[in-house]
């Protein structure tokens, strides 16, 4: 029999999201960030 | 609230065309996850599945009468549209529409909302 | 198809009992995303059915917790702790794994 349709089965988790950019000195431009649940990912 | 009413001609003969209305509110087809099915159950006897349209348009019928079934939708007049070809006594039942939704967050799979029922007579 | 087998399909009881009602599939129900999706409802005469318990043992929104269900891969029960009189009807199980999704024949609970 085929399947009926159904989720992935997995939750997902709603978290927020934030971009943030730091300055770290005129000759080296800026550092920009994407922290997901408190952990920088990019 | 959520709500769901089902409409129909009531009484048919042999061989005419079913076309069954299933209007609702509280919800909206044009939702993500969100999913209407029809259900029978002819008098005193048990319940059969007989279709399910989504909000994007996927449809799932069942096999033993796919031949005879057309489910469809009009997403912005909150309605689900049911056409069975060539009926029989056979068919003669209680036609329920009822709500699932397929959610990754919220459980929702599952028939939560059922109309009342209406009722088809197929008779000579 | 899948076969919902439903026993017993009458089940007289007295207010205050414990009723079980046994559901078997003729295969798996186990979806492929890892769920079941086994769902147990209550239909009173001249009632839609009403939802009591979905994917295998959660009971839905506002059903009483003297419905529980358990169960896994083919075998599934529904027990009822303490039969009140609001419980009488035809209780049917249902599984949404597989098309055509399909229920049980239905069991009566009813008073002796």
């Known amino acids: 029999d085929a399947e009926f349709r159904h989720d992935s089965g997995y939750e997902v988790h709603h978290q927020k999201l934030v971009f943030f950019a730091e300055d770290v000195g005129s000759n080296k431009g800026a550092i920009i960030g994407l922290m997901v649940g408190g952990v920088v990912i990019a | 609230q959520v709500t769901l009413k089902e409409s129909g001609p009531g009484i048919l003969k042999p061989s005419q065309t079913l076309s069954l209305t299933c209007s609702f509110s509280?919800?909206?087809?044009?939702?993500?996850?969100?999913?209407v099915g029809w259900i029978r159950q002819p008098s005193g006897k048990g319940l059969e599945w007989l279709a399910h349209?989504?909000?994007?348009?996927?449809?799932y019928y069942n096999p033993s009468l796919k031949s005879q079934l057309t489910i469809s939708k009009d997403t912005s007049r909150n309605q689900v549209f049911l056409k069975i070809t060539s009926v029989d006594t056979a068919d003669t039942a209680t036609y329920y529409c009822?709500?699932?939704?397929?959610?990754?967050?919220?459980?929702?799979?599952?028939?939560?909302?059922w109309g009342q029922g209406t009722t088809l007579t197929v008779s000579l | 198809d899948v076969l919902m087998t439903q026993t017993p399909l009458s089940l007289p009881v007295s207010l205050g009992d414990q009723a079980s009602i046994s559901c078997r599939s003729s295969q798996s129900i186990v979806h492929s995303n890892g769920n079941t999706y086994l769902e147990w409802y209550l239909q009173k005469p001249g009632q839609s059915p009403k939802l009591l318990i979905y994917?295998?043992?959660n009971r839905f929104s506002g059903v009483p917790d003297r419905f529980s269900g358990s169960g896994s891969g083919t075998d599934f029960t529904l027990k009822i702790s303490r039969v009140e009189a609001e419980d009488l009807g035809v209780y049917y199980c249902f599984q949404g794994s597989h098309v055509p999704l399909t229920f049980g024949a239905g069991t009566k609970l009813e008073l002796k």
């Open positions: 009822a709500r699932r939704s397929i959610n990754s967050v919220v459980p929702e799979d599952y028939f939560d909302y």
């Open positions: 509280g919800f909206s087809l044009s939702t993500s996850g969100m999913g």
């Open positions: 349209i989504w909000w994007d348009d996927d449809k």
């Open positions: 994917k295998v043992s």
